[in-house]
């Protein structure tokens, strides 16, 4: 018996110690979001265990005070979705004593109308403004620095129009140090963790993005007033490019922001000569007037692998050679505006074009190919180590188009016992239908049957291997009862069969000699019990008149026992 797995909050995460009573779930939110509800839930014991509180949610609050602000993020309510109307949100950021703040503009997208973002160099609504969205056409790529330890951020929205709002990153830094750099859609490595003068930082972009503006390497200079010698670069998904990596990503221009209208972009992807390319189109959300074309070669004269417009779900393409050309043309007239409108294409170098791509090993399992070369028709079987079970298809086949018939399976830890099954001549009581660890099954035999084995089985976890029942399923055997002692035949009569002991359930039959009639039951049964006993007293044979004799005979015949019984041959 266990609690259900708690729901992961959007823009947050949950960690669970155990799903059994006493177990706990801890929730936390991504930077910029605040937890609404209980941070910590406990699984309570009951016939059906339950969490002691509702799962919390992560919300972007409208304002707040962030004291001891070291690094973090403030986002407008609803971000990355749209904010609502008639908001006035104030955030106060306060760096630790002796430190100052730097603000990076991750995103600012305000509705045209009267929505406004003001950042003030101080701790209140009347502090001097140092950024005002009304006035500033372009976001300062170098961000903003506080001259003291505070920034006051003010977002106000009017009654019409809405947009994604804002996401601001803040970093506190010490006197004599530079602030922590930031690059959206990228990463950096630093020669020292606190960025004193002399620190160098090297930037790189996430796959699919290109470094633009600024420098790849920047240095913290000027001991009197430490600052970066160059502005941080930006990582942007650009229109067109030549890629010679064995794996990578091609993104629509500006992804995940919307691409522009009237674009004509061409990407060339080139891998090793004796290889080919697998294109995994993971996102394709373009307008009906936009066209994405894949050419099986290194220019636009090559064979068209596929041409697509409008939205389409996940699919894959394979080239026949080591080059592919991707062309994207967006409609000059209309644009599909919206976050994550565009495409995301992952590409991989795969072996030559008479084999399916190499399949990876899977954690906690192994694979067995039917033959070493992954040619058309090859079957690969995946199996899991003890304690794990295959999720998905365990058998994959290399198809005629050199793609695998199924997606890669995975080995999932087995967290329940198999169904121990029904036992003949019994009914069972189960504590939980899927038999998780801790579940019990109780067997109860039908009347007249006795239990051989354990009546209650419990599902136990094991260090190695799958969970196991505490015992084998029992059996319900017919009760072994004492026999009835034989009854003597009545005077002037006979009994059949003539045994000393009669097993429980057996029947004996009585008959009388000619001229005598039976008084009592002609057949009696050995009734099972402790002890077993006869169903009726034995009958007697009484002398009869001639009329009576004949009547009794006809009666005797009319009352003949069933064929299975045996009558005394004296009749």
């Amino acid at each position: 018996l266990s609690c259900h797995f708690p729901r992961r909050p959007a823009y947050g995460d949950v960690t669970v110690t155990s799903l059994h009573p006493g177990g706990s779930a801890r929730f936390h939110c991504a930077t910029g979001y605040q937890l609404k509800g209980a941070r910590h839930l406990t699984c309570l014991n009951a016939t059906q265990p339950f969490w002691d509180s509702k799962e919390p949610v992560c919300i972007a609050a409208c304002g707040g005070v962030i004291r001891n602000a070291t690094t973090g993020r403030i986002v407008s309510p609803g971000f990355p979705g749209n904010y609502s109307n008639n908001l006035t949100c104030h955030w106060l950021l306060e760096a630790p004593e002796g430190q100052r703040l730097h603000l990076h503009f991750e995103k600012v997208s305000l509705a045209e109308d009267d929505d406004r973002l003001i950042i003030r160099n101080g701790d209140n609504v009347e502090a001097p403004p140092v950024y005002d969205s009304y006035e500033v056409e372009y976001l300062p790529i170098e961000g903003l620095l506080s001259s003291g330890k505070h920034f006051f951020v003010e977002l106000s929205t009017d009654s019409s129009g809405a947009a994604a709002g804002m996401a601001l990153r803040y970093e506190a830094f010490q006197q004599g140090h530079c602030y922590e750099p930031f690059v959206k859609y990228g990463n950096f490595s630093s020669s020292t963790p606190t960025y004193p003068v002399g620190t160098t930082v090297e930037f790189s972009c996430d796959p699919g993005y290109t470094l633009e503006q600024g420098s790849i390497i920047i240095e913290c200079v000027d001991p009197h007033d430490p600052q970066w010698n160059e502005t941080e670069p930006a990582c942007r998904a650009v229109c067109s490019g030549e890629i010679t990596d064995s794996a990578g990503v091609v993104l629509s221009p500006n992804w995940p922001e919307p691409y522009g209208r009237g674009q004509d972009c061409i990407w060339g992807v080139h891998v090793e000569e004796d290889k080919r390319i697998m294109l995994d189109i993971r996102v394709l959300r373009i307008g009906p007037g936009d066209v994405l074309t894949f050419y099986d070669g290194d220019d636009l004269t090559a064979r068209v692998l596929g041409q697509y417009s409008g939205p389409r779900s996940h699919f894959k393409l394979f080239t026949s050679m080591a080059d592919v050309t991707i062309q994207f043309q967006s409609d000059p007239g209309t644009s599909v505006l919206g976050y994550q409108q565009g495409f995301v294409i992952h590409f991989f170098e795969v072996p030559r074009n008479d084999t399916c791509p190499e399949l990876p090993e899977i954690p906690n399992g192994w694979k067995s190919p039917s033959q070493p070369e992954l040619v058309h028709g090859t079957v690969v079987t995946y199996q899991c180590y003890p304690g794990y079970q295959v999720v998905g298809s365990s058998v994959l086949m290399c198809q005629w188009d050199l793609t695998w018939s199924e997606d890669l399976p995975s080995c999932q830890r087995v967290t329940s016992c198999h169904d121990p099954g029904d036992v003949e001549h019994s009914r069972r009581l189960i504590s939980s239908p899927k038999f998780p660890v801790g579940a019990t099954v109780q067997y109860i035999c039908d009347q007249g049957f006795v239990l051989m084995g354990s009546s209650i089985l419990t599902c136990h976890d094991r260090q190695a291997g799958s969970p196991k029942w505490s015992d084998r399923a029992p059996k319900c055997l017919l009760e072994q009862l004492k026999p009835c002692h034989g009854l003597s035949a009545p005077e002037n009569g006979a009994r059949s069969p003539e045994k000393q002991l009669h097993p429980a359930g057996a029947t004996i039959h009585f008959s009388c000699a000619p001229g005598y009639v039976l008084k009592g039951q002609a057949s009696i049964k050995c009734v099972p019990g402790h002890p077993s006993h006869w169903s009726d007293p034995p009958p007697i044979c009484r002398a009869a008149s001639l009329d009576g004799f004949y009547n009794s005979r006809s009666l005797d015949v009319a009352k003949a026992p069933a064929a299975s019984s045996t009558l005394d041959a004296a009749h």
Epitope: R116, N121, G122, A127, P129, V130, D132, Y134, S146, S147
Partner: antibody, heavy 116, light 107 residues
């Protein structure tokens, strides 16, 4: 386009008071603070203070705190500065400036002459 | 209060010449500095804000830069209408303070 139209030149006696105006147009008056700046003949610029027309909150330079009083009339989008107990030291050109980043738009100035 | 020290106080230059004016802040102003131009008739215009951002409509021959606590205004090639007074203004904290001004005269 943003315009700040200031009232005409003033001549005043020592000890008197004057009230000059600055009429804003081309933007939402309550969306920006209005600052006032003094420039004595042949001298540099000195910040007097500002008013937030939305809340009527005012902030003054401590050096001129008791000299100037800033007010605003939302209905006419006009800011006012009253100078009291005038002395010859108050003879100067007074500018109003919109409180954008680093005072983005300026009025043409009002000349005040204090003379007996 | 933050003191803004502006230099030179006056400067003679010829048409087409490149000139630079400097302001130094007595305290940290984090780049919150604007440059203003005052023409002989008293009109004041903002040229640059945030140390280096050009106000809309201002010719590209004007540029601003920062090096530590020193801020500069550069006019790459002087034109006749550029002969005027120039002031720096810090707007990092109240009270706002101005540099003493530079009078740029034609040689």
């Amino acid at each position: 386009q943003v315009q700040l139209q200031q009232s005409g030149a003033e001549l005043a006696r020592p000890g008197a008071s004057v009230k000059m105006s600055c009429k804003a147009s081309g933007y939402t008056f309550t969306s920006y603070t209005m600052h006032w700046v003094k420039q004595r003949p042949g001298q540099g610029l000195e910040w007097i203070g500002y008013i937030n027309p939305r809340s009527d909150y005012t902030k003054y330079n401590q050096k001129v705190k008791d000299k100037a009083t800033l007010t605003a009339d939302k209905s006419s989008s006009t800011a006012y500065m009253q100078l009291s107990s005038l002395t010859s030291e108050d003879s100067a050109v007074y500018y109003c400036a919109r409180g954008g980043l680093g005072l983005d738009y300026w009025g043409q100035g009002t000349t005040l002459t204090v003379s007996s | 209060d933050i003191q803004m020290t502006q230099s030179p106080s006056s400067l003679s230059a010829s048409l087409g010449e490149r000139v630079s004016l400097t302001c130094r802040a007595s305290q940290e102003i984090s780049g919150y500095l604007s440059w203003l131009q005052q023409t002989p008739d008293g009109t004041i215009k903002r040229l640059i804000y945030a140390a280096s951002t050009l106000h809309s409509g201002v010719p590209k021959r004007f540029s601003g830069s920062r090096s530590g606590s020193d801020y500069s205004l550069t006019i790459s090639s002087l034109e006749s209408e550029d002969f005027a007074g120039y002031y720096c203004l810090q707007y990092a904290s109240y009270p706002y303070t101005f540099g003493g001004g530079t009078k740029l005269e034609i040689k």
